[in-house]
C-alpha cells in the first residue's frame, strides 16, 4: 500500500481467483483514543471500532472511502483504490491502446519545436468518474523539472457504437536548452483513476524524436509567363524554432490530381520555393520536416492549381 | 579551418559534409532493424558516447561569441565516433553488407574532423578508454545504439555549420 495523495491510498493486488489479497491497517487521524467507529462509503454499517481498523482487501467491494467517527462526528477519511496485477502485468483497462507507433502505446506525445514544450494525449471509452494526474521530468535517476498543466478533455469521437474520448496535457521543460543534444529522455507519468481502480501509464522519449512541425504557412502560387509551370512559395511555420539558419527545415512539394489514383509528382527542397507543373484540377501541397533529424513530417498545407 | 589562432573553419565545406553525415547516419541505421533504444533499460551506452551539452557554446549566441568552444567539442565527438565505427563493434561479426553506408559514414567522420583540425594543429590528444570486448549478439545492439546517438550528435553539428555558413562566414 502506498499514498497517492493526502488520504488516498493505492493497494496493489495480485489479481487471480481466490487470491489472498492484502492486509491493510487504517489509522484514524485524531488525538482521540476511545469511542471510535469505522464505516465504508455511504453505508452506516459499523465495520469495527478503535483507533485502527484492520481489513483484508481482495476485491473492489473492499475498496472505497473508509471513515472513522466519534459520536456522529467525522474524524478522518481514507480512500482506498486498487491497482490490479494479472500474471505479473499491471492492468491497462482505463486507456485505449493506440497501437501507433507500436503495440501497447497508451500515451502519444508531439512537440512543434525544440523549446521544451510538448503535448501528450490518450484515448478512453470511459465517460464518467475519471480523473487524471500528470507528472514529468527529464531523466529518472537525477530528475530535472518539467511542468505539466491539468489534463483536459480535448475531443470526442464516435467509433462505431462507441464514443471515444481524447484527453490531452501540455508540458514545458523548466530549463530547456533547444540547441543541445539530449542525453536523458523526458519521462511522462500519468495516474488514471476510474471509480476505485488505479492505473499508471508512462512514456519515455527525446524531444527530437517527437518533433512534428506545423505545416508551412502562406503557401502561394505564381504562374510563370508562357508556361504551365508555377512557382510555389511558402514560409516556415510561426511555431518553428528560430533562428531558421540554425533550426532548418526541409520540404516536400507534391502535385496531386483530383483522383487519388493519379500519379503524384514529388520534389524535395531545402528552399522555401519550388517550380512545378500545375495540372488542371490538381492541387499543390507542401509539408515540412527537420532538415537534419528524421522525425515526423508536418501535415500538408495545400492550394488548388486553378 | 580552425587553426591555432582561432580563425574560422571552412563553414560551407563543413556544412556540406555535416549534412552528408546526417543522411549517411540515417541510411546506416536501418541495417540493424527496428528496436527501441530506451526499451533496453540501459542508459549506459547512451551515457558513454559524446553529447553536445548546454554549456558547450553550440547555440546561435554561443557561436557568435566564440565558436571555438563548440568546434572543439564537435571535433572531440567526431574523433570519438570515428574510433567507435572503426572498432570491432562494426568491423567484427556479423559482417556489415558490402554496400553498407557505415564505411562511408566512418570516412566522412574522419573527413569532417580533419576539416576542423588540419595537419599541424592539435587541440588536445584525443583519449578514448579501452573498448569492452563484444560478442556478435552484443554487437548488433551496440551498433544500433551508437548509430542512434550518432544521428542526434551529427544533427546538432549540422545545425552549427549551417548557421555558421549563413551568419559567420567571411
Amino acid at each position: 500500500i502506498w499514498e497517492l495523495k493526502k488520504d488516498v491510498y493505492v493497494v496493489e493486488l495480485d489479481w487471480y481467483p481466490d487470491a489472498p489479497g492484502e492486509m491493510v491497517v487504517l489509522t484514524c487521524d485524531t488525538p482521540e483514543e476511545d469511542g471510535i467507529t469505522w464505516t465504508l462509503d455511504q453505508s452506516s454499517e459499523v465495520l469495527g471500532s478503535g483507533k485502527t481498523l484492520t481489513i483484508q482487501v481482495k476485491e473492489f467491494g473492499d475498496a472505497g472511502q473508509y471513515t472513522c467517527h466519534k459520536g456522529g462526528e467525522v474524524l478522518s477519511h481514507s480512500l482506498l483504490l486498487l491497482h490490479k496485477k494479472e500474471d505479473g502485468i499491471w492492468s491497462t483497462d482505463i486507456l485505449k491502446d493506440q497501437k501507433e507507433p507500436k503495440n501497447k502505446t497508451f500515451l502519444r506525445c508531439e512537440a512543434k519545436n525544440y523549446s521544451g514544450r510538448f503535448t501528450c494525449w490518450w484515448l478512453t471509452t470511459i465517460s464518467t468518474d475519471l480523473t487524471f494526474s500528470v507528472k514529468s521530468s527529464r531523466g529518472s535517476s537525477d530528475p530535472q523539472g518539467v511542468t505539466c498543466g491539468a489534463a483536459t478533455l480535448s475531443a470526442e469521437r464516435v467509433r462505431g457504437d462507441n464514443k471515444e474520448y481524447e484527453y490531452s496535457v501540455e508540458c514545458q521543460e523548466d530549463s530547456a536548452c533547444p540547441a543541445a543534444e539530449e542525453s536523458l529522455p523526458i519521462e511522462v507519468m500519468v495516474d488514471a483513476v476510474h471509480k476505485l481502480k488505479y492505473e499508471n501509464y508512462t512514456s519515455s522519449f527525446f524531444i527530437r524524436d517527437i518533433i512534428k512541425p506545423d505545416p508551412p504557412k502562406n503557401l502561394q502560387l505564381k504562374p510563370l509567363k508562357n508556361s504551365r509551370q508555377v512557382e510555389v512559395s511558402w514560409e516556415y511555420p510561426d511555431t518553428w524554432s528560430t533562428p531558421h539558419s540554425y533550426f532548418s527545415l526541409t520540404f516536400c512539394v507534391q502535385v496531386q490530381g483530383k483522383s487519388k489514383r493519379e500519379k503524384k509528382d514529388r520534389v524535395f527542397t531545402d528552399k522555401t520555393s519550388a517550380t512545378v507543373i500545375c495540372r488542371k484540377n490538381a492541387s499543390i501541397s507542401v509539408r515540412a520536416q527537420d532538415r537534419y533529424y528524421s522525425s515526423s513530417w508536418s501535415e500538408w498545407a495545400s492550394v488548388p492549381c486553378s | 579551418r580552425a587553426v591555432p589562432g582561432g580563425s574560422s573553419p571552412a563553414w560551407t565545406q563543413c556544412q556540406q559534409l555535416s549534412q552528408k553525415l546526417c543522411t549517411l547516419a540515417w541510411s546506416a541505421h536501418p541495417l540493424v532493424g527496428h528496436m527501441d533504444l530506451r526499451e533496453e533499460g540501459d542508459e549506459e551506452t547512451t551515457n558513454d558516447v559524446p553529447h553536445i551539452q548546454c554549456g558547450d557554446g553550440c547555440d546561435p549566441q554561443g557561436l557568435r561569441d566564440n565558436s571555438q568552444f563548440c568546434l572543439q567539442r564537435i571535433h572531440q565527438g567526431l574523433i570519438f565516433y570515428e574510433k567507435l565505427l572503426g572498432s570491432d563493434i562494426f568491423t567484427g561479426e556479423p559482417s556489415l553488407l558490402p554496400d553498407s553506408p557505415v564505411g562511408q559514414l566512418h570516412a566522412s567522420l574522419l573527413g569532417l574532423s580533419q576539416l576542423l583540425q588540419p595537419e599541424g594543429h592539435h587541440w588536445e590528444t584525443q583519449q578514448i578508454p579501452s573498448l569492452s570486448p563484444s560478442q556478435p549478439w552484443q554487437r548488433l545492439l551496440l551498433r544500433f545504439k551508437i548509430l542512434r546517438s550518432l544521428q542526434a550528435f551529427v544533427a546538432v553539428a549540422a545545425r552549427v555549420f549551417a548557421h555558421g555558413a549563413a551568419t559567420l562566414s567571411p
Epitope: - | E44, P50, P129, L131, S134, Q138
Partner: antibody, heavy 120, light 113 residues
C-alpha cells in the same frame, strides 16, 4: 537483492591448484561482467581478471600464465583456478561485478571475500 | 599498465576534521569525447570487502553520505570527507577502469589521531 558469494578451500599446498567459486544472484549475467580481485594480508588490492558477459576473459599479465576463469550460467557460478601456487598467492580473494558497457566499468558490488592460505 | 599513486599513505585526524586524499594516475583517465573520468573510490574496513563510494571521479554512489565527495580530472583526483565520523576511519583505495588491466592505488589509511 544483489549478492556475490565466494567459496572454496581455505588451505592449499604449494605447487597445487587453487580453485574458487563465486555464486551470484539478483542480477542478469547478460548485463554484468564478473571480476576476481585479491588482497594479500595487510596489503593492497590486485586485479586478477575478468570474465565478460560474452564469456571471453582477460587476465592480469602478471598472473596470466597461471590463471583460468570460467562460468556455468545454468548455476550462476563463476570459477577461478590458479595453478602452481606459492606462499605469495596467500590472500583474501574477492569476486565483484561491473555493468557491461562500451567501456570497462567500476565494481559496484563485491563478495565478502574468502581467505586462501598457501602452506604445506 | 596505468600506475595509481595514492598519498598520503596514512592520514591521522580527529573526528569532525576534514580529510583530503589524493590519487594520481600515471596517465590521463579523462575520455575527452564523453568527458568522463574513469576513476572510482572505495572504502575498506578491517575484515570487510571494499565498498564503492564514488564513480566517474565525482558521482556519489546511492546510499553514500553527502560528506563524501570526489573531484579532479585527468591525472589528479581527490576524495574529500568534509567532517570525519568515527565510522569513516578505514582504508581508501582509488581504481582506474580507463584501460585494462584495472589497477588500484596503494591505499590511504585514515586513522584516529
Amino acid at each position: 537483492q544483489v549478492q556475490l558469494q565466494e567459496s572454496g578451500p581455505g588451505l592449499v599446498k604449494p605447487s597445487q591448484t587453487l580453485s574458487l567459486t563465486c555464486t551470484v544472484s539478483g542480477f542478469s549475467l547478460i548485463s554484468y561482467n564478473v571480476h576476481w580481485i585479491r588482497q594479500p594480508p595487510g596489503k593492497g588490492l590486485e586485479w586478477i581478471g575478468v570474465i565478460w558477459t560474452g564469456g571471453s576473459t582477460d587476465y592480469n599479465s602478471v598472473l596470466k600464465s597461471r590463471v583460468t576463469m570460467s562460468v556455468d550460467t545454468s548455476k550462476n557460478q563463476f570459477s577461478l583456478k590458479v595453478n602452481s601456487v606459492t606462499a605469495a598467492d596467500t590472500a583474501v580473494y574477492y569476486c565483484a561485478r561491473d555493468k557491461y558497457g562500451l567501456f570497462p566499468g567500476y565494481f559496484d558490488y563485491w563478495g565478502q571475500g574468502t581467505l586462501v592460505t598457501v602452506s604445506s | 599498465e596505468i600506475v595509481m599513486t595514492q598519498s598520503p599513505a596514512t592520514l591521522s585526524l580527529s573526528p569532525g576534521e576534514r580529510a583530503t586524499l589524493s590519487c594520481k594516475p600515471s596517465q590521463s583517465l579523462l575520455s575527452s569525447g564523453n568527458r568522463k573520468n574513469y576513476l572510482a573510490w572505495y572504502q575498506q574496513k578491517p575484515g570487510q570487502a571494499p565498498r564503492l563510494l564514488i564513480y566517474y571521479a565525482s558521482t556519489r554512489q546511492s546510499g553514500i553520505p553527502a560528506r563524501f565527495s570526489g573531484s579532479g580530472s585527468g591525472t589528479d583526483f581527490t576524495l574529500t570527507i568534509s567532517s570525519l565520523e568515527p565510522e569513516d576511519f578505514a582504508v581508501y583505495y582509488c581504481l582506474q577502469h580507463f584501460n585494462y588491466p584495472w589497477t588500484f592505488g596503494g591505499g590511504t589509511k585514515a586513522e584516529i589521531k
